[in-house]
Interface confidence: low
């Protein structure tokens, strides 16, 4: 039932899926609205059909529609009477069409929907004037999307009369200016998304009832909330991926729980100025609104001091230029549970009473320039709630002796890429001078530890005694195990993931024996010097094994390969100098499709390098000659 152009006519109803009161006709090349669906249909989805025009009476057969979706229907025109009988319609999706073409007619059509709650007009090349006309008189709307249009300026006429609106999505437009009062009529507005626009600053933010504000991916250099004592209900503020120079000036009274500041140009600058005359370091903003001019003065290094951060739970300050945290900064956030300072310029961190706050569960200080952590003397319970601590990629040589002793709940610790050494015996907590080693012993809660690329010397005795490690990464510490797994014996029965990549491990005299690692699921031995296959005990839990980039010349004996293939899901074997005459008995692994990189496994045959997949079954003919030679 296709017409000559290949589009289905409205008579072909077999193309729609009907479930209860919902009709799903998406992507069926329909040129018009089907007319013979059940009249009680409450939900009609016509996405991705080339309708072009929604005619008067198209929807007349369905007087009970509550939800209509016309996403990506090439709509250029909606006739004035298209929604005339649709008194029950609550949700209308018109995203990704061409409604700017006949916007006045479309606006007239929409005005017949006084009960509409949700309207999606995204991706229609609408300007602010077009949008204003379309939204006129739709006072029942709760949720509006104008994302992906060509809106540039907002004033109080655009959203006039939408006093019940709760959710407004304006992301991916070209908004560079928002006039004062543009949102004043939206007393119910709770979610506002302005991401991916061109806003240069927000210097008089006063939407006290807003709950979520997303202004990420703009060109903001300033964010200032209105001064004064108004109570703000803001819970989530996303200012990430902007060009902020200073910590945002937040409300004096707020319920802010999540503050996202990732990827800006922020720092604290007090140290750059003469602290005896701090009053000189201020900025003044001239706010011109009609014929009223206000001047706002802001102190640029105490920008956080008047902000209400008491409810803050999640703070992301990663990818900025913070060189230090001012005294009292973290003390203002007693409820903080997640703090991300990844990729800044921090050189030292002072740990004091309530700084970081006791509620902190995740702290990421990775990719900074930390050379020292300072622990205030006599602190009994600092970091007591901390579960995840990332110190990766800094310049630490050690940590203060009491630091981990007090952090009784840490489960995940990443100290990779710091030039640390492990303390030979339990470190004395009264040691003088900067910390020169790290002791993980008796960190009972510790389950995951990464020490990759730490330049560790040979491991001392029982370095992980008293921990609960299930994940351990010792990769890129050359010679640290000295061919023996003995330093891991305390944690061997618990370990599930063990990474021993690039460690110079060799097995010239004796195969590495993992018999005591009964729970090991994932073992990475890549980039070592192993010449023989590692040995595993009887009850093998291993699921993934990586042996790439070693010196293996023979594949494992048939017995071993069959044992491995029973539990093993994935094994990596490429980039080893196998002898093609030693591949016999690999059938079990090969047929079980366990070898993830089987297509890249090569072997040497008569000084040629051959892909194993190209070898015929059994032992190659050339090997029989080689074996005969050996027997002579």
């Amino acid at each position: 039932w296709r017409n000559r152009s290949g589009t289905a006519t409205a008579a072909s109803q077999g193309v729609c899926k009907l479930v209860g009161g919902a009709a799903d006709c998406r992507g069926q090349s329909l040129a018009s609205v089907p007319s013979s669906l059940p009249p009680h249909a409450r939900m009609l989805t016509l996405d991705a059909n080339p309708l072009k025009t929604l005619w008067n009476h198209s929807l007349q057969p369905y007087p009970l529609l509550e939800s209509l979706s016309l996403h990506s229907c090439h709509l250029e025109r909606i006739s004035r009477g298209a929604f005339q009988e649709q008194g029950h319609l609550r949700s209308l999706v018109l995203g990704d069409n061409c409604l700017s073409e006949n916007y006045e007619e479309t606006a007239a059509a929409l005005h017949a929907l006084p009960g509409l709650r949700r309207l999606d007009l995204s991706g229609n090349a609408l300007t602010e004037d077009m949008a204003a006309l379309m939204l006129q008189n739709l006072s029942s709307l709760r949720s509006v999307s104008l994302a992906g249009n060509t809106i540039m300026r907002l004033d109080d006429s655009v959203f006039e009369g939408l006093e019940r609106l709760r959710e407004l999505d304006l992301q991916r437009n070209y908004i560079f200016e928002i006039e004062g009062g543009a949102f004043d009529g939206l007393a119910e507005l709770r979610h506002l998304n302005l991401a991916f626009n061109n806003l240069p600053c927000i210097v008089d933010f006063g939407l006290t009832r807003l709950r979520v504000l997303n202004v990420s991916y703009n060109v903001l250099e300033w964010f200032l909330a209105t001064g004064g004592e108004a109570a703000f209900e803001l819970e989530t503020l996303d200012l990430s991926h902007n060009q902020l120079l200073f910590f945002p000036l937040l409300p004096q009274y707020s319920k802010l729980r999540t503050l996202l500041l990732r990827d800006n140009n922020m720092g604290f600058y007090r140290d750059l100025y003469n602290t005896s005359s701090p009053r000189e370091m201020v900025a003044q903003f001239l706010l011109v609104d009609g014929n009223v001019t206000n001047i706002t003065t802001v102190s640029l290094w105490e920008e956080f001091s008047s902000s209400d951060l008491a409810d803050l739970r999640f703070l992301d300050m990663s990818q900025n230029q913070f060189q230090y945290l001012p005294d009292g900064f973290l003390r203002k956030m007693p409820s903080l549970s997640h703090l991300n300072l990844h990729q800044n310029c921090l050189m030292t961190l002072h740990i004091r009473e309530h700084e970081p706050p006791g509620a902190l569960t995740e702290l990421d200080l990775s990719h900074n320039q930390l050379s020292e952590l300072h622990l205030a003397p006599g602190l009994a319970s600092c970091l007591g709630s901390l579960r995840l601590f990332n110190l990766s990629s800094n310049q630490l040589l050690g940590v203060p002796p009491g630091l981990f002793a007090n952090a009784r709940n840490i489960t995940t610790l990443d100290m990779s890429h710091n030039q640390i050494s492990l303390c030979p015996l339990p470190a004395a907590s009264d040691r003088v001078g900067p910390p020169s080693c790290v002791d993980f012993r008796n960190m009972a809660s510790l389950r995951s530890l990464s020490l990759e690329g730490c330049g560790l010397g040979a491991l001392p005795d029982c370095p992980f005694q008293g921990t609960s490690l299930t994940y351990l990464d010792l990769s890129s510490n050359w010679g640290v195990l000295n061919g023996s797994l003995a330093p891991l014996q305390d944690v061997a029965p618990m370990l599930q993931v063990l990474s021993l990549r690039n460690m110079g491990l060799h097995s010239s005299f004796m195969a590495l024996d993992f018999s005591g690692f009964g729970n090991l699921r994932d073992l990475d031995l890549s980039g070592n010097c192993l010449t023989t296959f590692p040995r595993f005990g009887g009850s093998l839990a291993l699921e993934t094994l990586d042996l790439r980039r070693n010196s293996l010349t023979a594949l494992p004996q048939k017995a071993v390969s069959e044992q491995l293939s029973r539990g093993l899901r994935t094994i990596y074997l490429s980039q080893n100098p196998y002898d093609c005459c030693g591949v016999d008995g690999w059938g079990a692994l090969q047929h079980g499709q366990t070898v993830a990189d089987w297509a890249m496994v090569t072997c040497n045959l008569s000084s040629k390098i051959i892909r194993v997949t190209e070898l015929p079954g059994g032992v190659p003919r050339d090997c029989k000659w080689e074996r005969l030679d050996l027997g002579l």
Epitope: R166, E167, D184, E229
Partner: antibody, heavy 118, light 112 residues
């Protein structure tokens, strides 16, 4: 401490009007809506409407349009509700309640009892 | 308007045991961004109502954690894990998804 102090009980004649007040303290008066609720004897709660003290905007339950008028006096942090053309049906306890963002009616006044009787 | 429906009385409960109170809305109170605009209030004899639960499952400040609430978009349950004498009163559910805000008729908690 947040407090909403309502005016005392009222006894009025049918056809008259009455103005009930609700004085707020302990928080920023203009930062929250003020709601009004009716509770007839032994009955449930009915939302009358609310006012935004910041700009005086009002929202009424259709049922109470023409019956109730909501106003505020910012200088004294006081909300008022005037009830017009009273009948015995209007006899009830009237509560004011603060409207927070997360929730409405996080704090209530102690209630004002209105009796309409000849 | 959204209609909130409650039973007038709960099953009588013994002190120290748990109690459940139900509420149904005529329309889903669950919004696309995951918040359910359902509230529970308790009115003790001779007192103003007090907020117990906001947005279906969040405990208001000062409310003991014996109280909890769960539900779908339209059917909700308030649970009291260990009923105490001071829990006696009328429990109202309410919605503030749409104006006008509407309350249930209230459920009286009865002690055996």
């Amino acid at each position: 401490e947040v407090q909403l102090q309502q005016s005392g009980p009222e006894l009025v004649k049918p056809g008259a009007s009455v103005k009930i007040s609700c004085k707020a303290s302990g928080y920023s008066f203009t930062g929250y809506f003020m709601n009004w609720v009716k509770q007839s004897h032994g009955k449930s709660l009915e939302w009358i409407g609310r006012i935004n003290p910041y700009n005086g905007d009002t929202f009424y339950n259709q049922k109470f349009k023409g019956k109730a008028t909501l106003t505020v006096d910012k200088s004294s942090s006081t909300a008022h509700m005037e009830l017009l053309s009273l009948t015995s049906e209007d006899s009830a306890v009237y509560y004011c309640g603060r409207g927070g963002y997360d929730y409405d009616f996080d704090y209530w006044g102690q209630g004002t009892t209105l009796t309409v009787s000849s | 308007d959204i209609v909130m429906t409650q039973a007038a009385f709960s099953n009588p409960v013994t002190l120290g045991t748990s109690a459940s109170i139900s509420c149904r809305s005529s329309k889903s109170l669950l919004q696309s961004y995951g918040i359910t605009y359902l509230y529970w209030y308790l009115q003790k004899p001779g007192q103003s109502p007090q907020l117990l639960i906001y947005q279906m499952s969040n405990l208001a400040s000062g409310v003991p954690d014996r109280f909890s609430s769960s539900g779908s978009g339209t059917d909700f349950t308030l649970r009291i894990s260990r009923v105490e004498a001071e829990d006696v009163g009328v429990y109202y559910c309410a919605q503030n998804l749409e104006l006008p805000f509407t309350f249930g008729s209230g459920t009286k908690l009865e002690i055996k």
